[in-house]
């Protein structure tokens, strides 16, 4: 493993590896207090990795512990040799007890795939360590899983192609090792926010990679380009999906998470964002009628501009369990927006607004909002995020998304916010006014808005209600209706994905 990370701030607990570093502290006390090695752990515990076949959705049921060379537990718990087999692999832990997401995932898999074998890989004794030690244990756990799979392959009708390893955080790299070490190729590995520290930039054999399974799909929900990234930033699968850019997840801000909580810490925000990958995957299992779609894009900024809502040439895919296998792609970065909770699905729209004249714009960018009116529902007032700046005599592209299915769009209200929202903007407005006292009226002209739905791939053009009135200024609004040439559906593939 690459040990080049000098500072490991994991779950907001800082641990300095540099020589002579002070005793590490986190928001809730000393790191070694939190991540103590349980006394007499390594000597007396045999084995350190346990495989629990969850035969029932009932959490009270003990399931069956599988061990290589012992066929009886397979019979006792009716292991189905021809069915899909899921191995769920947890990650590093600050506690000796399973995190709550595990029950949700097991339950969702049982609900969705009633005949499947669901195996929990319990490596808590090796994961409940200092993070660095847990990282060094991932290889060992990967070997254990590979040995289990090699033994199962000796059984009649068991196919490695039916195996789906699902690893969260450090568990995603464990899955990678297992896929690497097993004789043959496992069908699929899903990496749920694979861990970043000590894996970012590592060699492909020392982390999850597309070589580890026939299909490797990855959800990245806690990546950071500044500070230390809890989740890995680099793409490590055939498809790598970055919900909400892969960083700030809705519903996980300090205000959202802490709410009225008196003793909350930043740790809860980290947990919320890191664990969001699991909940997105659970959502894909239990809300298969509400699939979320991701769109291939070179980077998050381009996606935020609304440039990347195409489904041509497999450029879009369902996320989570329903993802369509794409072996021909490697490290394909895909993006989507989501809601703050289940069901996470949103409806994406690309809005192309051609600004054909632009008066007295001054220094500050205008703040625009749109409201979309559809046959099923009307949207809330949605901000148009200006990623760079408004260009005149050019087509400006924006991404907007709604939480509800609006149906077919009928009209659009475009609003230019009047009053400045900050002292900084007010100051810029004032300076702008002083520098152009004779031209106080800021104005721009828009004739039409072209809209493309990411989910249906339909394209529509909206024209101003009054062809003579195309100007908009601060505090004013402009209404657009479907142009007479109305629906202009291109022959683009709709993101309808056959469910596995």
């Amino acid at each position: 493993m690459s040990n080049s990370v000098p500072l490991l701030c994991f779950w907001s607990l800082c641990y300095c590896f540099a020589a002579g570093s002070p005793v590490p502290f986190g928001p809730e006390g000393r790191l070694e207090d939190k991540l103590h090695k349980p006394k007499a752990t390594q000597t007396e515990v045999k084995p350190s990795v346990r495989f629990n076949l969850r035969t029932s959705k009932d959490p009270e049921h003990e399931g069956c512990y599988l061990s290589v060379g012992h066929s009886q537990p397979l019979e006792d718990c009716s292991f189905n040799m021809t069915a899909k087999t899921f191995f769920i692999i947890h990650g590093w832990t600050m506690s000796g007890i399973f995190e709550n997401w595990l029950h949700k995932l097991v339950s969702a898999l049982h609900t969705r795939e009633k005949d499947a074998n669901v195996v929990v890989v319990d490596w808590l004794p090796l994961a409940h360590q200092l993070y660095t030690d847990a990282v060094n244990n991932t290889r060992v756990v990967g070997h254990s899983i590979a040995r289990m799979l090699d033994w199962l392959q000796e059984k009649d009708d068991f196919s490695l192609g039916n195996v789906h390893l699902i690893g969260y955080s450090l568990g995603a790299h464990v899955a990678g090792y297992a896929g690497n070490f097993v004789k043959g190729t496992v069908g699929r590995i899903t990496g749920l926010d694979p861990a970043g520290p000590m894996f970012e930039g590592a060699d492909i054999h020392k982390r999850l990679s597309p070589d580890d399974a026939d299909f490797v799909d990855v959800l990245h929900t806690y990546t950071r380009s500044f500070g230390l990234s809890i989740g890995i930033q680099m793409p490590v699968g055939h498809i790598d999906i970055y919900p909400n850019g892969g960083d700030f997840q809705p519903g996980c801000g300090l205000n959202d998470v802490l709410g009225s909580i008196a003793y909350g810490t930043i740790t809860e925000v980290v947990k919320c964002e890191h664990e969001r990958a699991v909940h997105l995957f659970v959502d894909s299992l239990v809300n298969q009628d509400k699939p979320s779609f991701a769109f291939q894009c070179t980077d998050s900024n381009r996606f935020k501009k609304g440039i990347c809502l195409s489904c041509r040439k497999n450029r879009c895919n369902s996320i989570g369990y329903n993802a369509k296998k794409m072996r021909n792609k490697r490290n394909s970065k895909m993006y989507l927006k989501t809601r703050a909770g289940m069901p996470f699905r949103v409806y994406h729209y690309q809005m192309k607004i051609h600004v054909f004249s632009y008066k007295n714009m001054g220094e500050i960018e205008p703040t625009f909002y749109v409201t979309l009116y559809g046959t099923n529902a009307d949207s809330q007032t949605l901000p148009l995020e200006i990623v760079e700046r408004i260009e005149q005599n050019a087509t400006n592209t924006f991404l907007v998304y709604t939480e509800e299915d609006l149906g077919d769009l009928l009209k659009i209200q475009l609003t230019w916010e009047g009053a400045s929202q900050s002292w900084y903007n007010l100051w810029k407005e004032f300076r702008s006014y002083l520098s152009q006292p004779r031209n106080p009226g800021r104005e721009l002209n828009i004739r039409r808005i072209r809209v493309k739905s990411g989910e249906t791939q339909r394209k529509l053009t909206f024209c101003t209600e009054d062809p003579e009135n195309t100007s908009i200024s601060p505090g004013r609004e402009l209404w657009f209706r479907k142009c007479r040439d109305g629906w202009r559906m291109k022959n683009e593939t709709s993101p309808t994905v056959e469910l596995p």
Partner: antibody, heavy 119, light 107 residues
Framework: EVQLQQSGPELLKPGASVKISCKAS????????MHWVKQSHGKSLEWIGG????????TYNEKFKDKATLTVDKSSSTAYMELRSLTSEDSAVYYC????????????WGQGTTLTVSS | DIVLTQSLATLSVTPGDSVSLSCRAS??????LHWYQQKSHESPRLLIK???QSISGIPSRFSGSGSGTDFTLSINSVETEDFGMYFC?????????FGGGTKLEIK
């Protein structure tokens, strides 16, 4: 039949320590987490912490981190909770409870151990 | 910490009535909510786990519903043996927490 048998009532002076036991039977002790819950007189329940008997890994409520220590003896299928630096605030009924496989819900509870701290 | 609020401290009902007890979480806890009954000088007894899953040996008149932040324990046709304290508990995140309890008493 699953049973959790707790040690008897304790009357102790402030500053003392006590170790409450919880002997499990009727299931594989190392397969389920054991949790401890405090109930002050006429009040609600407070989760103190949990232990994974398989290897001794623990999780504590921050509030009780300096008050309680959870341990197990696998050979006798017994869980222990030691409470230190006792004050009158620690007077309560303490329960051990067996977690489900994930440690979330508690289907079996001990009968409770009454702790009275008084000078 | 996640705060569980059981808004009704006491609920007075007549045997044979149907009753609903509520539990509200300070943040989304999905379905990680469990209900317990406790009679005087007894240990708590699990009634419903994971919001709606029934427990063997618990009468079918007890049922649970809800997800996210709002949860309900329903007792269809209350019997005299049902009187006592009812607590909700969350296992979504540590520390696990309990509601303040609702006392179900005879009217």
């Amino acid at each position: 039949e699953v049973q959790l048998q707790q040690s008897g009532p304790e009357l102790l002076k402030p500053g003392a320590s006590v170790k409450i036991s919880c002997k499990a039977s009727g299931y594989t002790f190392t397969d389920y987490t054991m949790h401890w819950v405090k109930q002050s007189h006429g009040k609600s329940l407070e989760w103190i912490g949990g232990i994974n008997p398989y290897y001794g890994g623990t999780t504590y409520n921050e509030k009780f981190k300096d008050k309680a220590t959870l341990t197990v003896d696998k050979s006798s299928s017994t869980a222990y909770m030691e409470l230190r630096s006792l004050t009158s605030e620690d007077s309560a009924v303490y329960y051990c409870a067996k977690g489900d496989y994930y440690g979330g819900s508690y289907n079996y509870w001990g009968q409770g151990t009454t702790l009275t701290v008084s000078s | 910490d996640i705060v569980l609020t059981q808004s009704l401290a006491t609920l007075s009902v007549t045997p044979g009535d149907s009753v609903s007890l509520s539990c509200r979480a300070s943040q989304d806890i999905s379905n990680s909510l469990h209900w317990y009954q406790q009679k005087s000088h007894e240990s708590p007894r699990l009634l419903i786990k994971y919001a709606s899953q029934s427990i063997s040996g618990i009468p079918s008149r007890f049922s649970g519903s809800g997800s996210g932040t709002d949860f309900t324990l329903s007792i269809n046709s209350v019997e005299t043996e049902d009187f006592g304290m009812y607590f909700c508990q969350q296992s979504n995140s540590w520390p696990y927490t309990f509601g303040g309890g609702t006392k179900l008493e005879i009217k």
